[in-house]
């Protein structure tokens, strides 16, 4: 007899998690001298620990401690580029700008970025059928508290001057509902970070609009600045421009405004 | 009651300084971003200059930069424009205004205004 | 010289309905919300319509704004001798980087 199977509202576990997974710790670990330590089957074993034969919405933080702890990684806390609801340009930039850090440029982030996955209490399966979305079924989710687990590790170890990519094309460019809103904002640490720069990145071609005096610029600046953090704010009015400035940083048309 | 209460303003000789003061009361003056606007006699409204919440953020027209400096002290509640190297042209009365909530560049309440009066 | 373009003056008879109109180019009015202030001789300014087409609350509904294009105009309906003010627009000038305010319209009530 078939065993019934919870029916979640999101999708299921990606294709191939595992060996996904461990194919981009190993990839990772080749590229980054830093990283040659790491024993992949050790992270592969730490990551399932964190949710197979756990009910998917009752997974904690403390589940992800072994993987954490095997993922720890020293990323320069001066050089971090946070970002919401922008991740490809954020990711175009830090490929250009080698010193400069996403949390999916660190192993951890690397590992699961853009992967769904799930397990199903007290068997050993991997649901690839659905898996719990966040508003309709549980925020206490394997991939949300993943997200949340290390977002918060990666905000705490940033220092002086942090630097956060906000998407300008949509009507809360600051939400205080996303990851960055509502972790990473939070666990920035004043005693160490002296300023949050946001770059607010404009999406039409002809748009002079100051988008550093949007609303939910107003409120991320009175969150922070509540925070005992110093703020500023940049338009970069064209982004292709700003990425062709990074590569090109001496080109006669980088020196006006982006 | 929400009010803005400029102060500070007065004669004084062209390239002399001067130091314009804004006290606010009745909303959380640490919310809210903050303007000078002044209006020459006769003249209408001309947009000086603009500061955020934790100071952050700062504009200024091309007619006084370089030469005023806008600040703010959330734990007096009190907003400043210090003014240098002051013209004839910046006679004036000069309005503070509180930026409207979750909004771009409205001002939703204004003080009465000082009287800054720049002639030998 | 402003940056915005207003009329100097315009009039009406009590009851009637006057429209006054700021123009711009696609710097200010076109990409940024438009703002209106009424000033009373000899009392400070009074944000009258906000982002566009809002009207703060304790603005009566004879005021309303609109915009299109680089233009934007403030329509006054049921004009009342209390009406008589300067009107300004204002917005901001993203090439000026700057807020900017036209000149003012005088409105006076007949």
């Known amino acids: 007899v078939p065993r019934w199977r919870q029916q979640w509202s999101g999708p299921g576990t990606t294709k191939r998690f595992p060996e996904t997974v461990l194919a981009r710790c190993v990839k990772y670990t080749e590229i980054h001298p830093e990283m040659r330590h790491v024993d992949c089957q050790s992270v592969w074993d730490a990551f399932k620990g964190a949710f197979i034969s756990k009910h998917p919405c009752n997974i904690t933080e403390e589940d992800y401690q072994p993987l954490m702890k095997l993922g720890t990684q020293t990323v320069p806390c001066n050089k971090i580029l946070l970002w919401s609801r922008i991740k490809d340009l954020a990711h175009q930039f830090t490929q250009v700008q080698r010193d400069m850090f996403t949390l999916e440029d660190t192993l951890l982030g690397y590992l699961a970025d853009d992967l769904t996955w799930c397990g199903e209490f007290n068997t050993s399966k991997i649901n690839y059928q659905s898996c719990p979305d966040w508003r309709k079924d549980c925020s206490n989710n394997p991939v949300s508290v993943f997200w949340k687990t290390v977002s918060r590790r990666f905000a705490e170890a940033a220092c002086d001057v942090v630097h956060v990519m906000l998407n300008g094309s949509r009507s809360k460019i600051f939400d205080k509902n996303s990851t960055f809103g509502s972790v990473e904002v939070h666990n920035l640490q004043p005693e160490k970070v002296q300023t949050l720069e946001a770059w607010v990145i404009h999406g039409g071609r002809e748009d002079s609009r100051d988008l550093c005096q949007d609303p939910t610029i107003k409120e991320l600046e009175s969150i922070i600045s509540k925070r005992n953090i110093q703020f500023s704010c940049k338009n970069i009015y064209r982004p292709d421009k700003f990425l062709q400035c990074v590569k090109n940083p001496e080109d006669s048309s980088c020196t006006s405004e982006i | 009651e929400v009010l803005l209460l400029e102060s500070g303003g007065g004669l004084v000789q062209p390239g002399g300084s001067l130091r314009l003061s804004c006290a606010a009361s009745g909303f959380t003056f640490s919310d809210y971003w903050m303007s000078w606007v002044r209006q020459a006699p006769g003249k209408g409204l001309e947009w000086v200059s603009t500061?955020?919440?934790?100071?952050?953020?700062?504009y200024y027209a091309d007619s006084v930069k370089g030469r005023f400096t806008i600040s703010r002290d959330n734990s007096k509640n009190t907003l400043y424009l210090q003014m240098n190297s002051l013209r004839a042209e910046d006679t004036a009365v000069y309005y503070c205004a509180k930026d409207n909530w979750n909004d771009y560049y409205g001002m939703d309440v204004w003080g009465q205004g000082t009287t800054v009066t720049v002639s030998s | 010289q402003s940056v915005l373009t207003q009329p100097p003056s315009a009039s009406g008879t009590p009851g009637q309905r006057v429209t006054m109109s700021c123009s711009g180019n696609?710097?200010?009015?076109?990409?940024?919300?438009v703002y209106w202030y009424q000033q009373v001789p000899g009392t400070a300014p009074k944000l009258l319509i906000y982002k566009d087409d809002q009207r703060p609350s304790g603005v009566p509904d004879r005021f309303s704004g609109s915009k299109s294009g680089t233009s934007a105009s403030l329509a006054i309906s049921g004009l009342q001798s209390e009406d008589e003010a300067d009107y300004y627009c204002a917005t901001w000038d993203g090439s000026l980087k700057a807020r900017v305010f036209g000149g003012g319209t005088k409105l006076t009530v007949l």
């Open positions: 500061i955020s919440i934790s100071a952050g953020i700062i």
């Open positions: 696609n710097q200010n009015i076109r990409d940024n919300y």
